[in-house]
């Protein structure tokens, strides 16, 4: 198959909604950047549809995306990261819809990892620490983190704390005693770059101590 639509297909195609969204990840694999796009309507027939990016590239005018099931993906060193690129949905040589986007404004950081919680008995608090690959990066270094925690039995009652460092102290008196808590963290660009929240880190689970009756404090 050539990938070109028949005339009838093209006419049908023009009736469809080809709106799409994209996010970039800078230095996601060494010095390689990635760009991921997907249609907003999951029911779009993507059989003959391709994505292409042109402009603000190094040593090439345009690049084609690879199709990975429902998403379209590029990993390359060739993003100039200056100025807007034109991202188009195409059938053959015909562009169905295009967006001009600066890839530094649609950055989705990598998810934080190594989340852990340590109880400090003497201080009566919990020290939350996590790691992010962005500390080692040249570009998207400065992030805002969103730490969310909840008592495991409270399905949707998350408490959120925003912070710019990778360490947070939770006071013991603010938590329920003898309870199981779930905690997770995500990140968003906070300086120069714009974009979206990362995926959540894997959750970490910890239990708060019992109340010590003599002192009114937790064990």
């Amino acid at each position: 198959e050539s990938g070109y639509a028949q005339n009838g297909d093209l006419e049908d195609a023009e009736l469809d909604d080809y709106s799409f969204s994209c996010y970039s990840q800078l230095e996601v694999n060494g010095s390689q950047h990635s760009l991921t796009c997907a249609f907003e309507d999951p029911d779009v027939n993507i059989t003959n549809l391709e994505f292409e990016i042109c402009g603000a590239l190094v040593e090439v005018k345009c690049l084609n995306f690879r199709k990975l099931q429902e998403i379209y993906f590029i990993e390359t060193k060739k993003f100039l990261l200056i100025g807007k690129s034109n991202i188009c949905v195409k059938v053959g040589e015909k562009s169905l819809t295009c967006k001009k986007i600066d890839l530094t404004t649609i950055v989705k950081p990598e998810a934080p990892f190594d989340l852990s919680v340590v109880y400090r008995e003497g201080a009566n608090d919990f020290v939350v620490t996590f790691n992010t690959s962005h500390l080692q990066k040249k570009y998207v270094k400065v992030l805002m983190h969103d730490v969310a925690y909840r008592q495991e039995k409270d399905e949707n009652k998350w408490t959120h704390v925003n912070l710019s460092s990778t360490k947070l102290t939770l006071l013991q008196r603010k938590l329920q005693p003898a309870a199981m808590y779930e905690i997770k963290v995500r990140s968003i660009p906070d300086h120069y770059f714009k974009g979206f929240w990362s995926e959540w880190s894997p959750s970490y689970y910890f239990r708060t101590p019992e109340i010590n009756n003599s002192s009114g404090e937790m064990d």
Epitope: G55, V58, K61, I82, G83, K84, D102, Y139
Partner: antibody, heavy 117, light 110 residues
């Protein structure tokens, strides 16, 4: 209507400094890549520097690297070029240009910098 | 680093067609877009062609741009020449983040 108005040019002695400004209006300044381009009297265009929409990315021609600094203030819709250690060969009309969706759609009227003792 | 070489001057009569070439010294002309600027005497440059062959709104369709891989060059063609087309014309491309300009071509409409 898009407008770019340069100012700050003038006569300066070799080794001296000048700060050029470019006031922008009529477009979304804070998502536009901005450039400085210069033109020596009777000569062609020479690219000087560029700055990304956010000020993070800055690049310079080899001829000015280490002497000139490009910056922007998005709150004031303004572009700047701090020029230090000026030389006679820096004498030129300096244009600010908006890249927008493509380079040079809009240029200012230019400001003349003369470096002479 | 590459250079863009243009003829120093060209001249032609009103109503005729003129082509200005812009040859890239190394690397492929296909590897980055070419823009063309017009600069009338005493004025700022204005874009007449961007991204090889695209015309900004307001630029007459007498102006066209093209790329020729075999000669590693870009061309600006102006048909139906008018006296107001008399100006300097510059090509421009990209070397990574740096902008590279051709030396300019003076077009005289006889």
């Amino acid at each position: 209507e898009v407008q770019l108005v340069e100012s700050g040019g003038g006569l300066v002695k070799p080794g001296g400094s000048l700060r050029l400004s470019c006031a922008a209006s009529g477009f979304t300044f804070d998502d536009s890549v901005m450039h400085w381009v210069r033109q020596a009297p009777g000569k062609g265009l020479e690219w000087v520097s560029l700055v990304g929409w956010d000020g993070f990315f800055t690049y310079y021609a080899d001829s000015v690297k280490g002497r000139f600094t490009i910056s922007r203030d998005n709150a004031k819709n303004s572009l700047y070029l701090q020029m230090n250690s000026l030389r006679a060969e820096d004498t030129a009309v300096y244009y600010c240009a908006r890249q927008g969706d493509y380079m040079g759609n809009n240029w200012g009227q230019g400001t003349l910098v003369t470096v002479s003792s | 680093n590459f250079m863009l070489t243009q003829p120093h001057s060209v001249s032609e009569s009103p109503g005729k067609t003129v082509t200005i070439s812009c040859t890239r010294s190394s690397g492929s002309i296909d590897s980055s877009y070419v823009q063309w600027y017009q600069q009338r005497p005493g004025s700022s440059p204005t874009t007449v062609i961007y991204e090889d062959d695209q015309r900004p709104s307001g630029v007459p369709d007498r102006f066209s741009g093209s790329i020729d891989s075999s000669s590693n060059s870009a061309s600006l063609t102006i048909s139906g020449l008018k006296t107001e087309d008399e100006a300097d014309y510059y090509c421009q491309s990209y070397d990574f983040h740096h902008l590279v300009f051709g030396g300019g071509t003076k077009l005289t409409v006889l």
